[in-house]
């Protein structure tokens, strides 16, 4: 028969014959021959291969370096890489999460729109009219101004995006 020019899925062409690829979690140690199938061996501890492959070396699991603020979110297997995330209060600098930076705080006049996660930074928004934030925080939202009326008080000092209103007693009408 004619030697093949293309092979089935999960096979590869070598020396004019189709050989089976190694399954995820295993590496290639010998191509198939007339007398034997492709020979594969499992990846070692702390190694992985995540596809059907003909790799002769497994990939090393990612190291979540605590010096860079990283910790293990999901331990790697022979078929999957380790997934890193950041320590509490930090977030990844990239999708690959190779290092971490401290969550940003929202300055006075700004509130937290979305609290940071291990992979995304704090999202701040300016406090709209009727709301204020007087602290630098990674958690605090803009607070509504105090409603003086509900306390039977009147506004003595108007609020800003950084300060609350100041309420005071109503002026009593003299007889």
């Amino acid at each position: 028969p004619e030697p093949p020019t293309a092979c089935r899925e999960k096979q590869y062409l070598i020396n004019s014959q189709c050989c089976s690829l190694c399954q995820p979690g295993q590496k290639l140690v010998s191509d198939c021959t007339e007398f034997t199938e492709t020979e594969c061996l499992p990846c070692g501890e702390s190694e992985f291969l995540d596809t059907w492959n003909r790799e002769t070396h497994c990939h090393q699991h990612k190291y979540c370096d605590p010096n860079l603020g990283l910790r293990v979110q999901q331990k790697g297997t022979s078929e999957t890489d380790t997934i890193c995330t950041c320590e509490e209060g930090w977030h990844c600098t990239s999708e690959a999460c190779e290092s971490c930076v401290l969550h940003r705080s929202c300055s006075p006049g700004f509130g937290v729109k979305q609290i940071a996660t291990g992979v995304s930074d704090t999202i701040c928004e300016p406090c709209p009219v009727g709301f204020f934030s007087n602290v630098s925080s990674a958690f605090e939202k803009c607070h509504p101004w105090t409603s003086c009326e509900t306390k039977d008080l009147v506004v003595q000092q108007a609020g800003t995006n950084k300060t609350d209103v100041v309420c005071g007693p109503q002026d009593r009408l003299r007889a």
Partner: antibody, heavy 114, light 112 residues
Framework: QVQLQESGPGLVKPSETLSLTCTVS????????VHWIRQPPGKGLEWIGV???????NYNPSLKSRVTISKDNSKNQVFLKLSSVTAADTAVYYC????????WGQGTLVTVSS | DIQMTQSPSSLSASVGDRVTITCRSS???????????LQWYQQKPGKAPGLLIY???NRFSGVPSRFSGSGSGTDFTLTISSLQPEDFATYYC?????????FGQGTKVEIK
């Protein structure tokens, strides 16, 4: 053409380590595996193990605790070590190249006796 | 490990006889690729085994056409259609589908 030649001491004392060398020609150790197989006198064949091109090894589970296969690519040599031998390890030892099953070494008889 | 059981363990036959040797494996030798790695070897006294048949039914180059192999799954057969004087030897089946590779215990073909 492909050739393999086994060599080593023909007599080993019980409890000692059997050491054999397989010298190959006609193919490349960095790209091909080498197997060891043995045959006790008047008995059948037993696969001992293999060293693959990259240096990884597979051993027969029945011998794994006692066997080590290694190689020196620069000398075209593969080595078999079998520790704590007994009379049951007396056999003709063969090496053969992976994918060259038509070509075996001529074999070397190792007798375990005091 | 996969056990390979040959039968008979020995047989007596005459030149010109048709000889059949069977080999049974303890589990299927069909690889996920669809290939079955079952070999037959011939061994004469004081010599290394010589390859006759590979992948169940493929005759190795230079092997006479009187040797043929057949079978599938777990049951395999080596047939010598017309026994010749040089065929008196011991025959082994061998599987290389699964590590550790294993051999049958051998079938000795003797002159009747």
């Amino acid at each position: 053409q492909v050739q393999l030649q086994e060599s080593g001491p023909g007599l080993v004392k019980p409890s000692e380590t059997l050491s054999l060398t397989c010298t190959v020609s006609g193919f490349s150790l960095p790209t091909s595996g080498v197997h060891w197989i043995r045959q006790p006198p008047g008995k059948g064949l037993e696969w001992i193990g293999v060293i693959w091109a990259g240096g990884d090894t597979n051993y027969n589970p029945s011998l794994k605790s006692r066997v080590t296969i290694s190689k020196d690519n620069s000398k075209n040599q593969v080595f078999l070590k079998l520790s704590s031998v007994t009379a049951a390890d007396t056999a003709v030892y063969y090496c053969l190249g992976h994918g060259h099953f038509d070509v075996w070494g001529q074999g070397t008889l190792v007798t375990v006796s005091s | 490990d996969i056990q390979m059981t040959q039968s008979p363990s020995s047989l007596s036959a005459s030149v010109g006889d048709r000889v059949t040797i069977t080999c049974r494996s303890s589990q299927s030798l069909v690889h996920s690729s669809g290939n079955t790695y079952l070999q037959w070897y011939q061994q004469k006294p004081g010599k290394a085994p010589g390859l006759l048949i590979y992948k169940v039914s493929n005759r190795f180059s230079g092997v006479p056409s009187r040797f043929s192999g057949s079978g599938s799954g777990t049951d395999f057969t080596l047939t010598i259609s017309s026994l010749q004087p040089e065929d008196f030897a011991t025959y082994y089946c061998s599987q290389t589908t699964h590590v550790p590779w294993t051999f049958g215990q051998g079938t000795k073909v003797e002159i009747k």
